[in-house]
Amino acid sequence: LSLEGSRTLTVCPGSVQPLSSQTLRASSSAGTDPQLLLYRVVRGPQLGRLFHAQQDSTGEALVNFTQAEVYAGNILYEHEMPTEPFWEAHDTLELQLSSPPARDVAATLAVAVSFEAACPQRPSHLWKNKGLWVPEGQRAKITMAALDASNLLASVPSPQRLEHDVLFQVTQFPSRGQLLVSEEPLHAGQPHFLQSQLAAGQLVYAHGGGGTQQDGFHFRAHLQGPAGATVAGPQTSEAFAITVRDVNERPPQPQASVPLRITRGSRAPISRAQLSVVDPDSAPGEIEYEVQRAPHNGFLSLVGGGPGPVTHFTQADVDSGRLAFVANGSSVAGVFQLSMSDGASPPLPMSLAVDILPSAIEVQLQAPLEVPQALGRSSLSQQQLRVVSDREEPEAAYRLIQGPKYGHLLVGGRPASAFSQLQIDQGEVVFAFTNFSSSHDHFRVLALARGVNASAVVNITVRALLHVWAGGPWPQGATLRLDPTILDAGELANRTGSVPHFRLLEGPRHGRVVRVPRARTEPGGSQLVEQFTQQDLEDGRLGLEVGRPEGRAPSPTGDSLTLELWAQGVPPAVASLDFATEPYNAARPYSVALLSVPEATRMEAGKPESSTPTGEPGPMASSPVPAVAKGGFLGFLEANMFS
């Protein structure tokens, strides 16, 4: 990697300057794409900040940028004006250039902020040169708020500063009035005044009357050393503008402004809704606006004018629809700082806000809303509803256009059909079931963000409060006992004070759920079951006949049961029991209680176990002899021989 360019940036005080390829230009011997030449800001500027033109100019400091972004003029340095005057200030940025696999290169970018530079944004080289407004035929003090050369003094080292002053030499006098210093008029024989006299409030302009034409004076300002000696240092020649206003003049009244809303990259006319004033004694063409500070999201242009930005326009331009805002690619809102004047009153500050609308928004739905069965309710989060466009939209508002069928949405505990992203993020928006007849629901919302809308459907599912233990593979051709070691809704029973019941929705593909007889005297064999209860599981009354896949050699396979679980006062939930099956292996210990084993293996299994007096199923098989109901195989055969 190599780094070219001057690595110096000259910035006008208080202005924004893009980094350019003249300033910073990286290249690699491999001819790497500028997008892949990455700068990391190791130490940011002290006198200002670095930011990206198309990202939030009020956000966090820029940490990374690419050479491509430098080429595009998107990396900007903004100098922040200090409270104390200065003539020249220096700032540095420490950067690290990287583009693997090349070694990183450290770089320092020097920034010079100087009043010496010619600045289109700032025609004066003085700390202040704002001009003066004076009523016709009257007088007004020229204070340091209007004219201030403190920055020239700031070029002198502070120990000697008290011995120095700034001498203003008037090179062209006002034509419609007089300048006075300590009540003495200035004239060709005495054309000077000092910064110290200005600071003491001794400089006055007196208008001579006879009209409201513009006035002003030209001057040269330079440093003056001890005992009035001229010293080398900064100097400037400028004009000071004096505006004479009609004493009868009523100042214009700015009207409330509505932000301009525009999609990025487009153009929109500025109307009176954005910029208007009430001024009964001025024509629209006499009301002038000047752009003091423009945002980074676009510029103002005049129809019929050049394609570039305009800094001056009139109310007539606005009223006729000639003034337009041209948005660039930025998605960030911005504000124009303007000054408005009717030419006879002091300028008034005004602002024009520009809100960049997304061309489209999208509601991101990352997951359905899962409602825990025993709770019957759940808070929405950004997982369910989040609006994005070219950026995240935290201000999004939602309105239900189709409510849920089996429940309702609550905000702060009360049913609501409208809510905000903020309420979602704070967990205040809750879906609660009110009708416990479905394990699913959905609702449709319309999302609105920055004037654009989009709709989305939020799906709701109930998460079963059911403990499922499938364990290792189960033997094909066997009947195993379905009990709470496999399916257990005991916690749901405790939470609802009811006996949960199950409905078989689907499966198994190879096999069936059966009810096994309680005693030998009970008639018939295993009955096919489609519904059962937690009590049936606890009583050991249920069996799962694990079938063999048809039409192929015995082999391991997967199967499942899909169940709907119901309990009082809560919504039903769908759950599944997924299990693996394999051909029966008599030598293998199975982790479930077997009620029967396949026919062929039964005769080889050795002596039957002794009968248990209770008639309960025997212990789980832990040896080649499987445990079976009624304490042995003969008991099982006897009980089931007519099935």
């Epitope: 409510g403 702060g412 009360r414 609660a432 009708n435 609802t496 006062g569």
Partner: antibody, heavy 112, light 107 residues
Amino acid sequence: QVQLQESGPGLVKPSQTLSLTCTVSGGSITDGYYWNWIRQHPGKGLEWIGYITFDGRNNYNPSLKSRVTISRDTSKNQFSLKLSSVTAADTAVYYCADFDYWGQGTLVTVSS
Amino acid sequence: DIQMTQSPSSLSASVGDRVTITCRASRGIREYLNWYQQKPGKAPKLLIYYTGSLHSGVPSRFSGSGSGTDFTLTISSLQPEDFATYYCQQYSELPWTFGQGTKVEIK
């Protein structure tokens, strides 16, 4: 603040259909969530009859479901109750409400 | 349906008394409970929603608490305008149901 006002005949003959309308002001019926009808038999407690939601879905009390219809007219900002085959046991004060706010109620007497 | 049972059915109290009315649900309703006040010949007025949230314009002497099946409405210092009948109502499960009411009378 939302205001509700019931209107309809105060006397209905047995076996006929009781019809009441609720006019909503100060808000839209597409904004509130539930628009309910509730009744109160003389000297007794409150009984929920049913609701219509902001998007036009209904739910009724199972004890009255076979006889009740609640509908709405969004253009007039109104919702209505129809209760068919009435008997003297349907004599009550009928209220429309969104639960936060209630109409003042209208007494309906079922008598020949 | 969920049954809502209020107790007592009626009570006599004096101005300034602390009054407590309870409401029991036949099964859990989480916090989805409203309390209403009704005066003779008038419509009910919402006092408290979501068990303990005060409706706008309701004096702070009214408060609600509870969760699940047992709920309480408390009037910290009874005022003359508080003599009325009070109803609880659940909105956890359809159909919505009301308690039978508690009449607060002047002793």
